[in-house]
């Protein structure tokens, strides 16, 4: 089965620059299929833009200005790239790549879409670091005692742009856990969002991870915020100086215990 | 040019109560095209639901039913037993791949229909209220209440800022909410909730602990030093990133 990944959750550009949006195809040979690009402007219908066929033929939608979009594919990396030249306000949109995927029976085809990349155009000069800054909240004793469950809360602040994806996993598991989240909120020139995960008592002794995807994450990798297991000693982390881990970094906390 | 027009911009549905989405075609006969349905959820993920000839995306066949009404020029999608997972924007789209019509392998989309999911009408349930703290940050967690109307107050004399609460459907089909705020004196902040003409306090849920229980976090101190990136510690602890915590037993 074909699968499409668009590694850039968003792409922020200033006017007249060039944006390059990537789409990685897996489960199917890119040189044996056509890749399609669609855009969804705010408040408008999703519209076909351009496609590149298995033999490299490019087809543009009528009415799309020539020279605006360029599409290509790199078989070695199984990637299709949509290049948007001379970006302007009207290019603000979410861009999706797509392909026709044959189902089990030949002839039964469906079109699958990538997760989309939002093109953001800004004229602001932002601080150097506009990646999400995490704060963790551990379950209250009252909740764990009374409800035999605990809620972890992951607060992310001072990020730009507003496009962010948060999910939760147990350590050493790739299963995405069912979580809940608030709306993304504007705070001055940046944004904040929080997500929370309620787990049963039996899972409180496991380490949990709040995984954050954002355009400005360090090194362009998902940020992993570690929530330590809750056993007999509950800890809280510092809000201002959280240390989240990128890639395979491991978070190390040094705790000082003061007995009464 | 053809146009796919959803019957409604927004459709509120109740958990477990069947709902029908309709999409009409303007400027053409819908029978000349194959109809597809997609769902876009939070985070822009576009998921394939249905394509004619009984083709369903993974996990959709049991709870969704697609159809086309040629006489009325309508595409129809039924959600047989909606759950909170079904919230999102639903799009009808058409193509003529494999049809006796003008061949096109691009999809033509209609505007989305926003489906909002509400819990099924049920007996009123009083919330549980818990406070979570970290430094100046305080979160008030309000769990398992019905109906939705609620007022959450974080009680403090030294407010820095407060945010609008997030109210969502809980997995059990009631509501959960979280309200966040920043306070100079976070240790003294409590949460009170007005729901169903009653007031519920976080202090109602506090438990007395003895030394065999959880260590109750009291305060967090931070050794402020020049900020550096997180390294990969092996045997070394980079002191500039050590969180100093005072845990009172």
């Amino acid at each position: 089965a074909g699968h499409l990944e668009q590694p850039q959750i968003s792409s922020t550009k200033t006017l007249s620059k060039t944006a390059r949006l990537e789409c990685v195809v897996s489960g199917i040979t890119i040189s044996a299929t056509s890749v399609y690009w669609y855009r969804e402007r705010p408040g408008e219908v999703i519209q076909f833009l351009v496609s590149i066929s298995y033999d490299g033929t490019v087809r543009k939608e009528s009415g799309i200005p020539s020279g605006k979009f360029e599409v290509d594919r790199i078989p070695e990396t199984s990637t299709s790239t949509l290049t948007i030249h001379n970006v302007e306000k009207q290019d603000i949109a979410t861009y999706y790549c797509a392909l026709w995927e044959a189902q089990q029976e030949l002839g039964k085809k469906i079109k699958v879409f990538g997760p989309g990349t939002k093109l953001i155009i800004t004229d602001k000069q932002l601080d150097a670091d506009v990646s999400p800054k995490p704060t963790i909240f551990l379950p209250s004793i009252a909740e764990t005692k009374l409800q035999k469950a605990g809620t972890y809360l992951c607060l992310l602040e001072k990020f730009f742009p507003d496009v962010i994806k948060i999910h939760w996993q147990e350590k050493k598991s790739n299963t995405i856990l069912g979580s809940q989240e608030g709306n993304t909120m504007k705070t001055n020139d940046t944004y904040m969002k929080f997500s929370w995960l309620t787990v049963p008592e039996k899972s409180l002794d496991k380490e949990h991870r709040c995984i954050v995807r954002h355009e400005n994450n360090k090194n362009g990798v998902d940020q992993e915020i570690i929530f330590p297991p809750i056993k007999t000693d509950v800890i809280t982390m510092d809000p201002k100086d959280n240390c989240s881990k990128d890639a395979n970094d491991t978070l190390l906390l040094q705790l000082t215990n003061t007995s009464a | 040019a053809i146009e796919l027009v959803p019957e409604h911009q927004t459709v509120p549905v109740s958990i477990g109560v069947p709902a029908t989405l309709r999409c009409s075609m303007k400027g053409e006969a819908i029978g000349n095209y194959y109809i597809n349905w997609y769902r876009k959820t939070q985070g822009n993920t576009m998921t394939f639901i249905y394509r004619e000839k009984d083709i369903y995306g993974p996990g959709f066949k049991d709870n969704f039913q697609g159809d086309i009404d040629i006489a009325k020029n309508l595409a129809v999608l039924k959600i047989l037993a909606p759950s909170e997972r079904d919230e999102g924007s639903y799009y009808c789209a058409c193509d003529t791949l494999g049809m006796g019509g003008e061949y096109t392998d691009k999809l033509i989309f209609g505007k989305g229909t926003r489906v909002t999911v509400e819990p099924r009408s049920q007996p009123h349930t009083k919330p549980s209220v818990f406070v979570m703290k970290n430094g100046t940050n305080v979160a008030c967690l309000v769990k398992e209440f019905y109906p939705k109307d609620i007022r959450i107050n974080l009680v403090s004399s030294k407010k820095i800022t407060e945010f609008d609460p997030a109210i969502v459907i809980s997995p059990s089909g009631k509501y959960n909410a979280v309200k966040l705020g920043k306070y100079e004196d976070s240790n003294s902040v409590t949460c009170s909730v007005q729901h169903d003409n009653k007031t519920v306090h976080s202090t109602d849920f506090e438990v007395k602990t003895d030394s065999t229980d959880h260590v109750k976090p009291k305060e967090t101190e931070n050794t402020k030093q020049p900020s550096k990136s997180c390294h990969k510690p092996k045997a070394i602890v980079h002191t500039e990133k050590v969180n100093m915590m005072s845990l009172t037993v």
């Epitope: 029976e105 039964k108 | 006969a29 000349n32 040629i70 494999g98 019509g101 003008e102």
Partner: antibody
Framework: QVQLQESGPGLVKPSETLSLTCTVS????????WSWIRQPAGKGLEWIGR???????IYNPSLKSRVTMSVDTSKNQFSLKLSSVTAADTAVYYC?????????WGQGTLVTVSS | SSELTQPPSVSVSPGQTASITCSGD??????ACWYQQKPGQSPVLVIY???KRPSGIPERFSGSNSGNTATLTISGTQAMDEADYYC?????????FGGGTKLTVL
């Protein structure tokens, strides 16, 4: 209720061109595909081709080299021309509306190819 | 283009169920239709999109289509159902008819 009516000569000489017209009344003409189907005596149905109101056509591959279809939206009519006819083209010719199926048919006109 | 194969004839007693099959390569991936034609008359659509009945067609007519076979079922067959029945399907460019089945009501 949509009605279709075929018209044209009932007798055509071999090697000549068969010409038929179908007039559509009491219904929408645009946005539909219109087809010609034929049936030799005592035999099955054979699809000849179809035309869209914009003029786009698709023909049966076995007849493609001899078939031409056209449309006149101002008169709600579409036409069939079949060139170089032989006795094997003798049949009842039906016009029909195509919407995922042939849902409306004319009553058919018999065309005999004979010298 | 693909071919559709039907049995030349099917017989049924009044009140019984008649089944007429139509087979073709991966027919289940396409939509199948069925037409009834009585002597001297134009064909009439009885089933479209595998299993849908146009208005005016009695409920005793039903259709199914999966794998390589589409089936027209007439339950409680009546004398007036005696006719030729044609299946039809399309692919991306052409329309194909089956050879026809003569239904005899004994």
């Amino acid at each position: 209720q949509v009605q279709l009516q075929e018209s044209g000569p009932g007798l055509v000489k071999p090697s000549e061109t068969l010409s038929l017209t179908c007039t559509v009344s009491y219904g929408s003409f645009s946005s539909f595909y219109w087809s010609w189907i034929r049936q030799p005596a005592g035999k099955g149905l054979e699809w000849i081709g179809r035309i869209y109101t914009s003029g786009g056509t698709i023909y049966n591959p076995s007849l493609k080299s001899r078939v031409t279809m056209s449309v006149d939206t101002s008169k709600n009519q579409f036409s069939l021309k079949l060139s170089s006819v032989t006795a094997a083209d003798t049949a009842v010719y039906y016009c029909a509306r195509w919407l995922r199926a042939f849902d409306y048919w004319g009553q058919g006109t018999l065309v005999t190819v004979s010298s | 283009s693909s071919e559709l194969t039907q049995p030349p004839s099917v017989s049924v007693s009044p009140g019984q169920t008649a089944s007429i099959t139509c087979s073709g390569d991966k027919l289940g991936d396409k939509y199948a239709c069925w037409y009834q034609q009585k002597p001297g008359q134009s064909p009439v659509l009885v089933i479209y999109q595998d299993s849908k009945r146009p208005s005016g067609i009695p409920e005793r007519f039903s259709g199914s289509n999966s794998g390589n076979t589409a089936t027209l079922t007439i339950s409680g067959t009546q004398a007036m159902d005696e006719a030729d029945y044609y299946c039809q399907a399309w692919d991306s460019s052409t329309v194909v008819f089956g050879g026809g089945t003569k239904l005899t009501v004994l």
